[in-house]
């Protein structure tokens, strides 16, 4: 449902920031003292790569309407969609582009969501329709990951800009995006 | 399909530490929000903690906190869960669960087979 | 911590109608629960039929539906049958710690 809604019409690009939708204070527990002390996940290194100026993947912020079927989200949410070729950074353009300035002979890598967040969102539906709550994930980083043919053509096929679950604006969850992401799909929505 | 695959059961003595695995399969651990659950013999499910991607962080019940430990090895796709000062009432069938949407987080749609741990002098 | 509460037991004839119910402890229950509803069968691991109030899972069959009904997280199963009879388990969202019901023993009779 929400990935259809991605890539159908739940990318309406919005000019302003919209405020993240709240869920209410009673379910804002403290959780400090059930947190773990060291239960976060480490955070990705941005690239694989040990020369990080040579590579470049851009993080652009679109602000969009979840839907769900007939329904869409009270507010707007901003997330992040992943760009770039993640090859030397002197040979790619400066402006975001849709050609191949610079194809690497060796290993592919390419610009894909590293974390994730989650977000609460109310979604509003027609005809007097109950509201309903939903966690929506929404990328939160990209990085350069390194693909081999085997995950171009074979692991790659589920995700798409699907690429956004929910999460609210606390820390980021470093989510590893592991080779699932269908670049083919990745290029031509983002 | 998310699977998930729990080590066997275990056999402990009172005060003893227990260490339950679950290997994730058609995901990556790091793509999903790992939970879990016991249940002990006759009795209703229980919540002992798990990832919230809204903190960014594991949060553990308070009945279980200071006493458990939820690791996550990413090489190898395995969850960790670690329980310490084992008692004989912590006898239970232990479950790792987690989500498997691609676009709403949905908690504990898919479920391991569960882990039998007894504890017993 | 919150209590969540639901019948102990209830009885449905084959073919009928039932509504179990998941109370919490804080006050009413709302969307932002996030209510789950989960089947188990004996000796087999729980399974997830309802997230979110009242989002259906592929498998789960179109004769279970949830709602929120007086204040309470609800799963009305119509048109029961023998292999519905199990236990039946909500769990409420609260803000990022999770809270387990009773469970309710659904006899199918």
């Known amino acids: 449902q929400g990935w259809q809604a991605f890539k159908n019409d739940a990318t309406e690009i919005i000019p302003e920031l919209g405020e993240y939708p709240e869920p209410p204070p009673e379910l804002e527990n403290n959780k400090t003292m059930n947190r773990a002390e060291n239960g976060g996940r480490p955070p990705h290194h941005p690239f694989e790569t040990k020369d990080v100026s040579e590579y470049s993947c851009r993080e652009l912020h679109f602000t969009r309407y979840v839907t769900d079927g007939q329904c869409r989200s009270a507010k707007p949410v901003t997330e992040l969609v992943c760009s770039g070729q993640c090859g030397p950074a002197r040979l790619l353009p400066n402006a975001i582009g849709r050609g191949k300035w610079w194809r690497p002979s060796g290993p592919d890598f390419r610009c894909i969501p590293d974390r994730y967040r989650a977000q609460r969102v109310q979604l509003l539906c027609p005809g007097g329709a109950a509201p309903r709550a939903r966690k929506v994930r929404l990328v939160a980083s990209c990085k350069c990951k390194r693909l081999t043919r085997f995950h171009n053509q074979s692991e790659l096929k589920d995700f798409g800009p699907e690429a956004a679950r929910p999460q609210k604006g606390r820390k980021p969850r470093p989510r590893a995006r592991g080779a699932k992401a269908n670049q083919a799909e990745l290029e031509n929505a983002y | 399909e998310v699977q998930l695959v729990q080590s066997g059961a275990e056999v402990k003595k009172p005060g003893a530490s227990v260490k339950v695995s679950c290997k994730v399969s058609?995901?990556?651990?790091?793509?999903?929000?790992m939970h879990w659950v016991r249940q002990a013999p006759g009795k209703g499910l229980e919540w002992m903690g798990g990832?919230?991607?809204?903190?960014?962080?594991?949060i553990y019940a308070q009945k279980f906190q200071g006493r458990v430990t939820m690791t996550e090895d990413t090489s190898t796709d395995t969850a960790y869960m670690e329980l310490s000062s084992l008692r004989s009432e912590d006898t239970a069938v232990y479950y790792c669960?987690?989500?498997?949407?691609?676009?709403?987080?949905?908690?504990?749609?898919?479920w391991g087979q569960g882990t039998l741990v007894t504890v017993s002098s | 911590q919150a209590v969540v509460t639901q019948e102990p037991s209830l009885t449905v004839s084959p073919g009928g109608t039932v509504t179990l119910t998941c109370g919490s402890s804080?006050?009413?229950?709302?969307?932002?629960?996030?209510p789950y509803w989960f089947q188990q069968k004996p000796g087999q691991a729980p399974r997830t039929l309802i997230s979110?109030?009242?989002d259906k899972h592929s498998w789960t069959p179109a004769r279970f539906s949830g709602s929120l009904l007086g204040g309470k997280a609800a799963l009305t199963l119509s048109g029961a049958q023998p292999e519905d009879e199990a236990e039946y388990y909500c769990?409420?969202?609260?803000?990022?710690?999770?809270?387990f019901g009773g469970g309710t023993k659904l006899t199918v009779l």
């Open positions: 058609g995901y990556t651990l790091t793509e999903l929000s």
């Open positions: 990832f919230d991607p809204e903190a960014g962080e594991t």
């Open positions: 769990l409420l969202d609260y803000g990022g710690s999770f809270v």
């Open positions: 979110d109030t009242n």
């Open positions: 669960a987690t989500d498997g949407e691609l676009y709403w987080y949905k908690f504990f749609q898919h």
């Open positions: 804080t006050g009413a229950v709302t969307i932002w629960h996030y």
